[in-house]
Interface confidence: low
């Protein structure tokens, strides 16, 4: 297993509709054809897998399990979108990238993106 650098933004604020997007960029040492991306969430000293996708370079990311994640890839960048977020989902979202094929296997883990989610206030009653 060889180490690889992964960069991602430090902070992202989710939209009022509970959607957060960020870029996960990895320094590929070789010409990988198969890449696996996993998003981990760290909060309250617990780390959980949020979603995972394996993709062939140049193709779209396909996430498992009717996931709350979607994504596209462009070169060594993965554009990730997480939807359906609520205030309780606030936390550090870590991008983990694995170069699966061809060998050698590379693993990179980013420092995480702190995603802040604020539940929208209910709209006040209006006469209009």
């Amino acid at each position: 297993c060889k180490a690889m650098h992964v960069a991602q933004p430090a902070v992202v604020l989710a939209s009022s509709r509970g959607i957060a997007s960020f870029v996960c960029e990895y320094a590929s040492p070789g010409k990988a054809t198969e890449v696996r991306v996993t998003v981990l969430r760290q909060a309250d000293s617990q780390v959980t897998e949020v979603c995972a996708a394996t993709y062939m370079m140049g193709n779209e990311l396909t996430f498992l399990d009717d996931s709350i994640c979607t994504g596209t890839s462009s070169g060594n960048q993965v554009n990730l979108t997480i939807q359906g977020l609520r205030a309780m989902d606030t936390g550090l979202y870590i991008c983990k990238v694995e170069l699966m094929y061809p060998p050698p296997y590379y693993l990179g883990i980013g420092n995480g993106t702190q995603i802040y989610v604020i539940d929208p206030e209910p709209c006040p009653d209006s006469d209009f």
């Epitope: 897998e49 949020v50 498992l64 399990d65 996931s67 359906g84």
Partner: nanobody, 126 residues
Framework: EVQLVESGGQLVQAGGSLRLSCAAT????????LGWFRQAPGKEHEFVAA????????AYADSVKGRFTISRDNAKNTVYLQMNNLKPEDTAVYYC???????????????????WGQGTQVTVSS
């Protein structure tokens, strides 16, 4: 409506192992994440582990990581909790629950689960 029935709980010595099962009935079972919670005497419900619809993604509480393994067999509509190296503090009633929304959320919040089993008692003696 999904119904969940837990089984496998019993009295076991510290350091021992148990496998809990949660059998589900209902057509939508395979579309949802499922979790195990536990409630020790006089304490609140505590998240133990969760698994995604296809079984590819898992989450564990720190207190059980490395000792417990959650898995599921969608052909049998059953979720399992393999518990190794059990400790007296694992004594509790263990409940299986279904997350209320389709997709993987790995939630530790009780309110996010809408279908619950009746529970199975696990007692670990020292």
């Amino acid at each position: 409506e999904v119904q969940l029935v837990e089984s496998g709980g019993q009295l076991v010595q510290a350091g021992g192992s148990l496998r809990l099962s949660c059998a589900a009935t209902g057509r939508t079972y395979n579309s949802y994440s499922l979790g195990w919670f536990r409630q020790a005497p006089g304490k609140e419900h505590e998240f133990v582990a969760a698994i995604s619809a296809s079984g590819t993604l898992r989450a564990y509480a720190d207190s059980v990581k490395g000792r417990f393994t959650i898995s599921r067999d969608n052909a049998k509509n059953t979720v399992y909790l393999q518990m190794n190296n059990l400790k007296p503090e694992d004594t509790a009633v263990y409940y299986c629950a279904r997350h209320h929304s389709v997709g993987w959320r790995a939630s530790h919040h009780l309110s996010d689960y809408d279908n619950w089993g009746q529970g199975t008692q696990v007692t670990v003696s020292s």
